[in-house]
Amino acid sequence: FERTRSLQDPCSNCPAGTFCDNNRNQICSPCPPNSFSSAGGQRTCDICRQCKGVFRTRKECSSTSNAECDCTPGFHCLGAGCSMCEQDCKQGQELTKKGCKDCCFGTFNDQKRGICRPWTNCSLDGKSVLVNGTKERDVVCGPSPADLSPGASSVTPPAPAREPGHSPQ
């Protein structure tokens, strides 16, 4: 089948990194600079993505694969293939239309991206709060109150928040 297909379509012999050049009698020509073809049998090469402005190059374009971008420090990727860069906030904050805002009481954000989330409700699981939550940290749940020995205090003050905390991914 492969042999039959290649007799019918000479372009199927062109490997990744080349294109089937109609202007040159369907000869396999290398992709021009700043373009690539990631599969064989292509009739054109795709233009390489350029990482400009707030984007920076994570992986250079090659003749067989597109460039990959990530974001400059202070920003993080959003969307498939890092299609957008969004501003980082500090731990204990979330990004709103008006910029970075502190988490409201009862919520936290332990990352430089994302939203403030409610502290975990330990009682959902029949547990008690072992370590109190802060703007930067969720509570830590502990054993159920019944599991604690008499006279034992269940709640520990929160651990001091420290940078860098949860790094942006």
Epitope: D110, T120, D125, L130, V140, C141, A159, G165, H166
Partner: antibody, heavy 119, light 107 residues
């Protein structure tokens, strides 16, 4: 009781993809993080990423960013990790885990799914 | 990423012995340190969370201590059923990272 039941072993060819499932029961699925952890043969444990099923917010280990896609289906209380462009180095046992109440520890582990990549 | 240096990588001890494993993160992780047990059948179980808190149902011979960059896991009196590999894990900073494991064998 809290349980995570994973899909069965898979054998795949290099370049293929595989989707491992993790069905949760015995608790409110949307209220706890689900993590995915990899263990290559004879090696230690490696955190791949996690998902908060309530809003499908995900975190990834940079090492797995181009390899894994983590999703969750609230209607069936099932989390998934899809691995793409498989290579022999992806041969491993993949575990799903649930947090203990806050994301900082993993209290319940699935039985593990063995993924073998071989030509 | 935070590197977790766990030692020893393996150890052999007798029933009734006191066994100690250490875990040293490459940076301060406060008390966000957990210990897991992986049995030979590959099942994994959380034993200790937040440095020293014993998971409900886990025998009291298991304990943990430490803070910051120096942590210890102890089995006060080794039992035959404790044959397993033990891992530490930091939950302070993404990506979460594990120690390389300590394989425990009975003499």
């Amino acid at each position: 009781q809290v349980q995570l039941v994973q899909s069965g072993a898979e054998v795949k060819k290099p370049g293929a993809s595989v989707k491992v499932s993790c069905k949760a029961s015995g608790y409110t699925f949307t209220s706890y993080w689900i993590n995915w952890v990899r263990q290559a043969p004879g090696q230690g444990l490696e955190w791949a990423g996690n998902i908060y099923p309530s809003d499908s917010y995900t975190n990834y280990n940079q090492k797995f960013k181009d390899k894994a896609t983590i999703t969750a289906d609230k209607s069936t209380s099932t989390a998934y990790m899809e691995l793409s462009s498989l290579r022999s180095e992806d041969t491993a046992v993949y575990y799903c885990t649930r947090d203990y109440g806050s994301a900082y520890s993993m209290s319940t582990w699935g039985q593990g799914t063995t993924v073998t990549v071989s030509s | 990423d935070i590197q977790m240096t766990q030692s020893p990588s393996s150890l052999s001890a007798s029933v009734g012995d006191r066994v100690t494993i250490t875990c040293r993160p490459s940076q301060d992780i406060s008390n966000y340190l957990n210990w897991y047990q992986q049995k030979p059948d590959k099942t994994v179980k959380l034993l200790i969370y937040y440095t020293s808190r014993l998971r409900s149902g886990v025998p009291s011979r298991f304990s943990g201590s430490g803070s910051g960059t120096d942590f210890t896991f102890t089995i006060s009196s080794l039992q035959p059923e404790d044959i397993a590999t033990y891992f530490c894990q930091q939950g302070d900073t993404l990506p979460y990272t594990f120690g390389q494991g300590t394989k425990l064998e009975i003499k």
